[in-house]
Interface confidence: low
């Protein structure tokens, strides 16, 4: 499972949809990120 | 304008220490995802830790190669991130990059610093 | 951790041709991959997000595909300052990771 901040604020928020832990808007932190980056 | 400027680096000694800064100015510092990157001369990219923004309650995450031995640190009120960097070693030497990413809905904020060089060396 | 592999390591080609580089992942990392480009003694920077959205000011020319583990950078025609190292990364667990980079030269 994904479990990067990005990831628990999108789950937190309900961004992510229920196949399979896609964010619906397609993002993706850049850090480096990371998010991040 | 929106800047990040990392200061700090320099030539240390194997098992030194050296505190990087990252001045943030032209966006909401504290609304922002933080991580530090560094590149040793002449390799790739290699992600050293993040801290989350104070929504996120500041939470952190680091590299395998840096637990323990490096803190990041934020502190919003001076738009500053912050690298304690402890026991150093040879293979830490590299330029440090700090890049700061916000998601406003539709789409990202990403900003990089220009870098700043630490070598580790006696 | 989650490794990234880019290829080729080197692509050689000639301004206005098409440039098709890859990014394979280890385990599945969804759509939590970036694109960056890197010139030599500048900060990275960002393309793409989220495997295929084309990041502030990015030109057209540039785009991103793929999910799961297989993720490609197109550049479908080369203009002379594209000429750089290209990174891949993935944010999806922890550490973040990146590519060891597709260096894109002149031919």
């Known amino acids: 499972a994904c479990d990067t901040a990005t990831c628990v604020t999108h789950r937190l928020a309900g961004l992510l949809s229920r196949s399979g832990g896609v964010v619906k808007n397609n993002f993706v932190p850049t850090n480096v990120g990371s998010k991040a980056f | 304008e929106v800047q990040l400027v990392e200061s700090g680096g320099g030539l240390v000694q194997p098992g030194g220490s050296l505190r990087l800064s990252c001045a943030a100015s032209?966006?909401?510092?504290?609304?922002?995802?933080i991580s530090w990157v560094r590149q040793a001369p002449g390799k790739g990219l290699e992600w050293v830790a993040e801290?989350?923004?104070?929504?996120?309650?500041?939470?952190?995450h680091y590299a395998e190669a840096v637990k323990g031995r490096f803190t990041i640190s934020r502190d919003n009120a001076k738009n500053s991130l912050y690298l304690q960097m402890n026991s150093l070693r040879a293979e830490d030497t590299a330029v440090y990059y700090c890049?700061?990413?916000?998601?406003?809905?539709?789409?990202?904020?990403?900003?990089w610093g220009q870098g700043t060089l630490v070598t580790v060396s006696s | 951790e989650i490794v990234l592999t880019q290829s080729p390591a080197t692509l050689s080609l000639s301004p206005g041709e098409r440039a098709t580089l890859s990014c394979k992942a280890s385990?599945?990392?969804?759509?939590?991959v970036s694109w960056y480009q890197q010139k030599p003694g500048q900060a990275p920077r960002l393309l793409i997000y989220?495997?295929?959205n084309r990041y502030l000011g990015i030109p057209a020319r540039f785009s991103g595909s793929g999910s799961g583990t297989d993720f490609t950078l197109t550049i479908s025609s080369l203009e002379p300052e594209d000429f750089a190292v290209y990174y891949c990364?993935?944010?999806?667990?922890?550490?973040?990771?990146f590519g060891q980079g597709t260096k894109l030269e002149i031919k």
């Open positions: 032209g966006f909401t510092f504290s609304n922002y995802w």
């Open positions: 890049t700061g990413y916000f998601d406003y809905g539709l789409a990202i904020q990403n900003y």
């Open positions: 801290i989350r923004s104070e929504s996120d309650a500041s939470a952190t």
């Open positions: 989220g495997a295929s």
């Open positions: 990364s993935q944010s999806y667990n922890y550490p973040y990771t």
């Open positions: 385990k599945r990392v969804t759509t939590y």
